[in-house]
């Protein structure tokens, strides 16, 4: 799903207040709901009819440093007999997410939000046949 | 997928530098890759064998203000005849994502990262059979 454009109004102070100095704002240390847990069914990436593998990308100047991307294993979907059904298609489910980019020059450290497109998993679909002449 | 705990080291300055004052840091305005596009306007939520609906939550003090959550429509999966196959299960695919929480008291505005659990879509899986002896 798509993150709407920020328009930067979200990060501005009310009009009656003095503007933010130097085009930056104050970000408090600590993360709300940091201990929240994901309760995804076990091994769904292998048990799905549209199975996928995971690839981990690592960047020490990004939070989270580890971003996991899914890749569908097949073009078709896996049927009850374990064979590939090519009349159906395994398609990626994608999600825009925010990460924090760290920028530093010596002891001057600043941070910036960055949009990242993550493939979270795959699902099996019936293609809509709209042939363009 | 799970975002690892921050440990807050990511947001700290190098040890040789003076500490961050007041437990906050500088966040630059603007978002990297803001114009990146998601090519998801294809109604896969209706054409999946594990279809889902979307619910939008809105919070003006969160960026993005709009967070979309998916809910699987069925317990089973939809077969080629359009009927529900209860020998298979529709399960949610979840992703931890970051949002920015805005906190203000008068003209003093600060921001804090928040972890949010988003259900991005659903996939069809073969249930794990636990045989009880």
């Amino acid at each position: 799903r798509k993150i709407p454009k920020v328009g930067h109004t979200f990060f501005q102070k009310p009009e009656s207040c003095p503007p933010v100095p130097g085009g930056s704002m104050k970000l408090d240390i600590g993360i709300i709901n940091e201990n929240q847990r994901v309760s995804m069914s076990r091994n769904i990436e292998s048990r799905s009819t549209s199975p996928w593998n995971y690839t981990v990308t690592w960047d020490p100047n990004r939070y989270p440093s580890e971003v996991v991307q899914a890749q569908c294993r097949n073009l078709g979907c896996i049927n009850a007999q374990g064979a590939e059904d090519i009349s159906m298609n395994s398609v990626p489910i994608q999600q825009e997410t925010l990460v924090v980019r760290r920028k530093h020059q010596g002891c001057s450290v600043s941070f910036q939000l960055e949009k990242v497109l993550v493939t979270v998993g795959c699902t099996c679909v019936t293609p809509v046949i709209h042939h363009v002449q | 997928r799970k975002i690892p705990k921050v440990g807050h080291t990511f947001f700290q300055k190098p040890e040789s530098c003076p500490p961050v004052p007041g437990g906050s840091m500088k966040l630059d305005i603007g978002i990297i890759n803001e114009n990146q596009r998601v090519s998801m306007s294809r109604n896969i939520e209706s054409r999946s064998t594990s279809p889902w609906n979307y619910t939008v939550t809105w919070d003006p003090n969160r960026y993005p203000s709009e967070v979309v959550q998916a809910q699987c429509r069925n317990l089973g999966c939809i077969n080629a005849q359009g009927a529900e196959d209860i020998s298979m299960n529709s399960v949610p695919i979840q992703q931890e994502t970051l949002v920015v929480r805005r906190k203000h008291q008068g003209c003093s505005v600060s921001f804090q990262l928040e972890k949010v659990l988003v259900t991005v879509g659903c996939t069809c899986v073969t249930p794990v059979i636990h045989h009880v002896q």
């Epitope: 593998n53 009349s87 795959c122 | -």
Partner: antibody
């Protein structure tokens, strides 16, 4: 205009490997599947496999598993196929062919073809 | 895998003549697709989803059939129609092609 430009003819020795490429233009490479098809001396067409750059998904004909490896380079909008442990049976014309996007057309719905790459295996 | 058997293997026709070639599948398929190939060139998409003509294909061509039996028909043969025609299915893995029907001009 959709175009699939394949690499030139190859003469290779038995036991060797060869990698042939298919450079695309005129459409968004990531959004469509690329298939590879073998045609031995003007005869029957045999589907080797297909790969989708967006989903990462691949599908192979069992007859070519271990023989062919399909890859894509999104940055150059190029699909490639490597053939290994070549024998005289592998001498053929190999075509890349564009399939569907998986959303509006099936991944296996082939519409455009490259001009073909001739591979000759001979000592 | 689904085997597609095309008949006849070779046929000849005069200009203006009606031509019909067939494609028989070893198991039922939902759709059949056809490609045209002329000597020394790559195949071209010709008929898809059993009966839909690809862009630029003359209206004298038509496709029909269901289940295991499909056909391609040319109402009045023209010189430019001389080529090999291949049927193809992607109902079942792996995708397969027929051996082709070579249509020659008399």
């Amino acid at each position: 205009e959709v175009q699939l430009q394949q690499s030139g003819p190859e003469l290779v020795k038995p036991g060797a490997s060869v990698k042939i490429s298919c450079k695309t233009s005129g459409y968004t490479f990531n959004e469509y599947t690329m298939h590879w098809v073998k045609q031995s001396h003007g005869k029957r067409l045999e589907w080797i496999g297909g790969i989708n750059p967006n989903s990462g998904g691949v599908s192979y004909n069992q007859n070519f598993k271990g023989k062919a490896t399909l890859t894509v380079d999104k940055s150059s909008s190029t699909a490639s196929m490597e053939l290994r442990s070549l024998t005289s049976e592998d001498s053929a014309v190999f075509y890349c062919a564009r399939g569907g996007d998986g959303y509006y057309t099936n991944y296996f719905d082939i519409d455009y073809w490259g001009q073909g790459t001739s591979v000759t295996v001979s000592s | 895998q689904i085997v597609l058997t095309q008949s006849p293997a070779i046929m000849s026709a005069s200009p203006g003549e009606k031509v019909t070639m067939s494609c028989s599948a070893s198991s039922s398929v939902n759709y059949m697709h056809w490609f045209q190939q002329k000597s020394g060139t790559s195949p071209k998409r010709w008929i898809y989803d059993t009966s839909k003509l690809a862009s630029g294909v003359p209206a004298r061509f038509s496709g029909s059939g269901s289940g295991t039996s499909y056909s391609l028909t040319i109402t009045d043969m023209e010189a430019e129609d001389a080529a090999t025609y291949y049927c193809q299915q992607w109902n079942s893995h792996p995708l397969t092609f027929g051996a082709g029907t070579k249509l020659e001009l008399i």
